[in-house]
């Protein structure tokens, strides 16, 4: 067992051109905090994969307000170290993710807003018990300077914190088979301690805190016999003695999740969903307080000042779970209407609306005629979120600003000829036809289909269409 310690020295603009804008402003003061996530080995998993070695959240830094016109300086940092306790051996190689979060303190509806400012990641080799290692990482235009170390918690010692030391019982030498503990020559290696509760008959360990099962036994403490009587849901190889398939231990057999955690199988292993107050790969870490930084993804920890009182994580938008460890697919609820597309921006949900629609969920069909005049006597017609002008005669285009060619549609019937006129069009009708559009034949007896021609117009005269 031991503790990984991280000290943030500075966070600010990196060298070179393109200094980033200050994340805080006079209108929106803010403060920074950091989250560290550790994974064993030289992991290249996505940032969302579990922090199997542990995670920690810093305190909030001092409130910062940008000085107008000034470049972004190194920003004020939270006090103290980030500490990630590890219960088992220190792996020697590890991956880290350090996130810089901004908490905006403006007039936010529903409390402060969190947003991820920068994320740096890396893979390192580190022996426990060594000196502080210094590092500089850049994320875009930001630069983070930090140092880190891993140290063992007594009685563990060594580069992996796997050797246990106890004061000598006799002044002269250590017990049978046990060596002195270098560099603490006055202490002796202690015998291996298996995981608490590991069956002494059916389990053994080669590393402290481990519980490996003898053949025929399974479960986290090797207390569950492997069944040979049932051939249902076969999993393992065929048994020569019974002739049926003996279930090999599935990742969730015997429930490896401690403290009431529930186990679910994953493609490569298993995942424990822990009850509040417990975390770790197998929900084995208990007595958690807010000082342990149990809330992931920028969750705010409340209560839990001592190990006996529970803490509560207030999760930022987009995360849920007792430790804010689960990302919510908020867009899967289809909140956007009228063909709007849903964007989950982490700190907020946004609907990108199609033309003609507006509102937080694209629920408003825009009144496109409001404040939008149609020129030259046209009238506005709404429909489907789009605005359209019904133009007066002689005009066209989206806003009736274009002078239309009234003859373009060939409005004069029966071979009549069309003439554009300032107030519309005029049809010169072919012999035998009359009317505004030459639509009426003149009867052979001289009478027309119309009751009478208007005074002053003879059949065949050009008809002006008003």
């Amino acid at each position: 067992a031991g503790v990984f310690e991280l000290q943030i020295h500075s966070f600010g603009p990196g060298p070179g051109p393109g200094a980033p804008r200050s994340p805080c402003s006079a209108r929106l003061p803010c403060r920074l905090f950091f989250r560290v996530c550790l994974k064993p080995g030289l992991s290249e998993e996505a940032a969302e994969s579990p922090c199997a070695l542990g995670a920690a959240l810093s305190a909030r830094g001092p409130v910062y307000t940008e000085q107008p016109g000034a470049p972004a300086p190194d920003l004020p940092l939270p006090d103290g170290l980030l500490q990630v306790p590890f219960r088992d051996a220190w792996p020697g190689t590890f991956s880290f993710i350090i996130e810089t979060w901004r908490e905006e303190l403006g007039d936010q509806i529903g409390g402060p807003a969190w947003s991820l400012l920068a994320r740096v990641a890396g893979r390192r080799r580190l022996a426990a018990g060594g000196p502080w290692a210094r590092d500089i990482q850049r994320a875009g235009a930001w630069e983070l300077r930090f140092s880190y170390r891993a140290r063992c918690e007594p009685p563990a010692v060594g580069t992996a914190c796997t050797r246990l030391c106890r004061p000598r019982s006799a002044p002269s030498r250590c017990g049978p088979g046990l060596r002195p503990c270098a560099p603490l020559e006055d202490e002796c290696e202690a015998p291996l301690v298996c995981r608490a509760g590991c069956s002494p008959e059916h389990g053994f360990c080669e590393q402290p805190g481990e519980c490996r099962c003898l053949e025929g036994w399974t479960g986290p403490l090797c207390t569950v016999p492997v069944s040979t009587s049932s051939c249902l849901s076969p999993r393992g190889p065929s048994s020569a003695t019974t002739g049926c398939l003996v279930p090999g231990p599935g990742p969730c057999d015997g429930n490896p999740c401690a403290n009431g955690g529930s186990c679910s199988e994953t493609p490569r292993s298993f995942e424990c969903t822990c009850p509040r107050g417990f975390y770790g790969l197998r929900c084995e870490v208990s007595g958690v307080t807010c000082a342990d930084g149990p809330c992931f993804n920028g969750g705010l920890c409340v209560g839990g000042a001592d190990p006996d009182s529970a803490y509560i994580c207030h999760c930022p938008p987009g995360f849920q779970g007792s430790n804010c460890e689960k990302r919510v697919d908020r867009c899967s609820l289809q909140p956007c209407r009228n063909g709007g597309l849903c964007l989950d921006l982490g700190h907020a949900l946004r609907c990108r609306c199609r033309a003609g629609f507006a509102g937080p969920r694209c629920e408003h069909d825009l009144d496109d005629c409001a404040g939008r005049a149609c020129a030259n006597g046209g009238t506005c017609v709404e429909g489907g979120g789009a605005h359209r002008c019904s133009c007066a005669l002689g005009f066209g285009g989206r806003d009736c600003r274009e002078r239309a060619d009234p003859c373009a549609a060939r409005p004069c019937a029966h071979g009549g000829r069309c003439y554009a006129h300032f107030s519309g069009l005029v049809c010169a009708c072919a012999p035998g036809y009359m009317g505004a559009r030459c639509e009426f034949p003149v009867h052979p007896d001289g009478a027309s289909a119309l009751p009478a021609a208007p005074p002053g117009l003879r059949p065949g005269d050009p008809q002006r269409y008003l």
């Epitope: 908020r330 956007c336 709007g340 597309l341 964007l343 990108r352």
Partner: antibody, heavy 124, light 110 residues
Framework: QVQLQQSGPGLVKPSQTLSLTCAIS??????????WNWIRQSPSTGLEWLAR?????????DYEVSVKSQITINPDTSKNQFSLQLNSVTPEDTAVYYC??????????????WGQGTMVTVSS | QSVLTQPPSASGTPGQGVTISCSGS????????VNWYQQLPGTAPKLLIY???QRPSGVPDRFSDSKSGTSASLAISGLQSEDEADYYC???????????FGTGTKVTVL
């Protein structure tokens, strides 16, 4: 896993119509969370988004403004595929054409699955 | 043709870091998430980072991005030979009502 398989001719004559099809496996063209896109790439213009179709209670289509009058995108639910038609092609339409899915919930702008690409040459 | 501007090339030796910039405007990068794609020679682009520093599974955390105002940048730390490829930024543009891509940056591992 989700795969997109493109089909269509590699050579089209100028002024003719280019037709490409993208067959979807492992997802549905009528998915309520995906968008289905056509993108092309040429040395002269780089990557260029052309069109998309998607279903949210009904079908919606969007087109890149400069090719809007020339292009049609159509989903085919019976065959679980979508197609692109580009009318009156010119040598400038010579490019590698890709279909792609915008399939990450909450990130419709991110094209997470791409077809293999079809090299289309417009030449007489 | 491309609305987003990237440097044509960037290079570094193995283990070094390299940063690619992507400059846009208020209607694209300024108001929408940025996505980054990696394109190896002769293959289709592959989504590398989406919605401002989210990575699809399988993408190493050596790749990270950041955004400030109307510019974004992609940082590759611990450069490896397999990182040699073309990199494109992309975002939705509210003004054009369509997706826009960057001009592309060729990363060479020396």
């Amino acid at each position: 896993q989700v795969q997109l398989q493109q089909s269509g001719p590699g050579l089209v004559k100028p002024s003719q119509t280019l037709s490409l099809t993208c067959a979807i496996s492992g997802d549905s063209v009528s998915s309520n969370s995906a968008t289905w896109n056509w993108i092309r790439q040429s040395p002269s213009t780089g990557l260029e988004w052309l069109a998309r179709t998607y279903y949210r209670s009904k079908w919606y289509n969007d087109y890149e403004v400069s090719v809007k009058s020339q292009i049609t995108i159509n989903p085919d639910t019976s065959k679980n595929q979508f197609s692109l038609q580009l009318n009156s092609v010119t040598p400038e339409d010579t490019a590698v054409y890709y279909c792609a899915r915008g399939g990450i919930v909450g990130a419709p702008d991110a094209f997470d699955i791409w077809g293999q690409g079809t090299m289309v040459t417009v030449s007489s | 043709q491309s609305v987003l501007t990237q440097p044509p090339s960037a290079s570094g030796t193995p283990g070094q870091g390299v940063t690619i910039s992507c400059s846009g405007s208020s209607s694209n990068i300024g108001s929408n998430p940025v996505n980054w794609y990696q394109q190896l020679p002769g293959t289709a682009p592959k989504l590398l980072i989406y919605s401002n520093n989210q990575r699809p599974s399988g993408v190493p955390d050596r790749f990270s991005d950041s955004k400030s105002g109307t510019s974004a940048s992609l940082a590759i730390s611990g450069l490896q030979s397999e990182d040699e490829a073309d990199y494109y930024c992309s975002a939705w543009d509210d003004w054009l009502n369509g997706y826009v891509f960057g001009t592309g940056t060729k990363v060479t591992v020396l």
